[in-house]
């Protein structure tokens, strides 16, 4: 089998450690690329034949043109990451009470704040910030890289040679931790959403606290809840049509537990998209309400779908399941007048849906224009 | 689950051609490499070939270059194998199978070459 | 081409006992920094193959702990500590790190 995702997450382990580089130590960065380059050379007996091979080989080749690095070079070593105590550091490995977030985080605080962080449709992405963005990010892209998990998306395009793109692939990498969880990895792909582990199990593995991560399958093959209670967090994934959705509800302090914030500029939960894969869905939102849908596909940042909605019946078909007139109904119209895929209705819908049950500020479930990443804000 | 169903054999004589079918489901059969093999009756395995996610390239055993090609139709999800100038040392049980280096197989289907 | 060969072709092993199948290269499977893909193979009969052992000593998903792989270069061993009457069929080595691939031509495995 192809062991790509080890290269994946050995130079998400370069790049984000307590010694990694920092964004603009260019050399250690060039250095991390290109252990990664070799590493991925290594499996591609394995793995040449696969997409996430040859969307490994081309991230690398942007990122390495992206800061100037040559091929030729020292080449970093993988660091395994010492993990934080997720309570007090005076508690016993192995008591029950450091396998449950909120209640080893009482310990030491009042009440943990949560953030949400989601991503659906064509896609968007609503950051830990509550930012909203549209984003190409095809491809292989972190999502989340912290010192208990990672989660990688890929990305693919909705339709041939188009800039808009829908996530067909999940990885969460659950890292071991304490005497709670042995690591664990989840992988769901477009119709294979299963409610195990990669490995077949159903939660953290052998130790003594395995019961505070725990997979449920809420309805076969569309929608997988995960609990990871030893961080205090809840994953949502769900399959929409086609594509996946992903949504999380994680306490700051999981959020924050990063070694070196200045090499986080990849995760997208964190920072958001880079500025260069952005679309800026609103202005073509106005534009395709302002022109009709006949001058839609000068304004789209995708070819026109073989059968796309015209203007007038895209919003009807959002105004159905999103009476709210926020984000969620704007990149719920955009995304039926990019892709004529009415799945995607009920993407931004269960999305929202998502946020009313991991969001804990009940006043921040619609966002609205004027929380927009407006441009330059990275 | 993994699910991998080949069809398309029976018998043909010399020199005839058969086109075999893999209909894959249960994974995202267009982000995967798929490989054919062949198993003679009461013998070993033999690698036939690979091809890649989007067909951008395809690798043969010496033994079936030039009368044998590969090609998927990702929208199908289905995994095709030609085979031309049959021989009668092609007689074999047919599998396809997942991945760069195959990981899930099918049930195979059997192919006869005989006069 | 590489070739694989196994020894033993045929072998008889008791309920409960261990059992050890070797696969000798013609040349090495070593393709970069110790990556060697080298992988085994179990077909029960009637049966299609099944992936045991991948990249000589990973057990794939849902294969037991009692079967385990070893080797390197162009020596392999793949061992059963302990036989059930499930594991009959034929065990193959293969080789992926030079085109083309190829396997072993077989070990059948029956109980005594």
């Known amino acids: 089998p192809c062991k790509i995702l080890k290269c994946n997450s050995e130079f998400w382990s370069a790049t984000s450690g307590s010694h990694a580089p920092a964004s603009d130590d260019t050399p250690e960065f060039c250095a991390a690329l290109r252990s990664y380059a070799l590493c991925t050379r290594r499996t591609a007996r394995t793995c040449r034949g696969d997409l996430a091979y040859h969307s490994a080989v081309h991230g690398i080749e942007d990122l390495m043109s992206q800061h100037n690095c040559s091929k030729d070079g020292p080449t970093s070593q993988p660091r395994l990451r010492t993990l934080p105590p997720a309570g007090d550091s005076q508690e016993r490995s192995d008591s029950p009470e450091i396998c449950h977030y909120e209640k080893s985080f009482h310990k030491h605080s009042a009440t943990p704040n949560y953030t949400h962080c989601g991503l659906f449709g064509d896609p968007h992405l609503r950051t830990f910030t509550d930012r909203f963005q549209t984003c190409k990010v095809q491809g292989a892209w972190p999502l989340i890289d912290n010192n208990y998990l990672n989660v990688q998306v890929t990305n693919t395009p909705v339709l041939p040679g188009s800039a808009a793109t829908a996530t067909s692939k999940l990885t969460i990498i659950f890292k071991n931790f304490q005497e709670c969880v042995d690591q664990k990895v989840y992988q769901a792909e477009m119709d294979e959403l299963p409610a195990a582990f990669v490995d077949g199990s159903k939660n953290g593995g052998d130790k003594h606290g395995a019961n505070s991560l725990k997979i449920t399958e809420k309805v076969s093959g569309q929608h997988v809840e995960i609990q990871a209670k030893y961080i205090g967090t809840t994953i949502v994934v769900r399959q929409v049509g086609r594509y996946l959705t992903f949504a999380v509800r994680m306490p700051e302090e999981v959020v924050n537990a990063v070694e070196d914030w200045d090499s986080q500029g990849l995760y997208l939960c964190l920072r958001g998209c880079p500025l260069n894969q952005q679309i800026d869905f609103q202005a073509f939102h106005t534009n395709a309400e302002g022109t009709g849908a006949r001058r839609l596909a000068a304004a789209s940042p995708a070819p026109t779908a073989p059968e796309t909605f015209p203007y007038e019946t895209a919003v009807a078909k959002c105004k159905e399941k999103l009476p709210v007139e926020d984000l969620y109904y704007q990149a719920c119209v955009f995304d039926l007048l990019t892709t004529g895929d009415v799945n995607f209705t009920l993407a931004a819908y269960y999305a929202l849906e998502d946020v009313k049950m991991l969001h804990s500020n009940k006043d921040k479930l619609h966002l609205y224009e004027r929380t927009r990443d407006l441009p330059g804000r990275a | 689950e993994v699910q991998l169903v080949e069809s398309g054999g029976g018998l043909v004589q010399p020199g005839g051609s058969l086109r075999l079918s893999c209909a894959a489901s249960?994974?995202?059969?267009?982000?995967?490499?798929m490989n054919w093999i062949r198993q003679a009756p009461g013998k070993g395995l033999e690698w036939i070939g690979m091809?890649?996610?989007?067909?951008?390239?395809?690798h043969y055993a010496d033994s079936v270059k030039g009368r044998f090609t590969i090609s998927r139709d990702n929208s199908k999800n289905t995994l095709y194998l030609q085979m031309n100038s049959l021989r009668a040392e092609d007689t074999a049980v047919y599998y396809c199978?997942?991945?760069?280096?195959?990981?899930?197989w099918g049930q195979g289907t059997m192919v006869t070459v005989s006069s | 081409d590489v070739v694989l060969t196994q020894s033993p072709l045929s072998l008889p092993v008791t309920l409960g006992q261990p059992a050890s199948i070797s696969c000798r290269s013609s040349?090495?499977?070593?393709?970069?920094?110790?990556?060697?893909?080298l992988e085994w193979f179990q077909q029960r009969p009637g049966q299609s193959p099944r992936l045991l052992i991948y990249?000589?000593?990973n057990r794939f998903s849902g294969v037991p702990d009692r079967f385990s792989g070893s080797g390197s270069g162009t020596d392999f061993t793949l061992k059963i500590s302990r036989v059930e009457a499930e594991d009959v069929g034929v065990y193959y080595c293969?080789?992926?790190?030079?085109?083309?691939?190829?396997f072993g031509q077989g070990t059948k495995l029956e109980i005594k």
């Open positions: 199978a997942k991945g760069t280096t195959p990981d899930y």
């Open positions: 249960g994974f995202t059969f267009s982000n995967y490499g």
């Open positions: 091809i890649y996610y989007d067909s951008s390239e395809k």
């Open positions: 040349q090495s499977l070593e393709y970069s920094d110790g990556y060697t893909f």
């Open positions: 990249e000589v000593s």
């Open positions: 293969f080789q992926a790190t030079h085109d083309p691939l190829t």
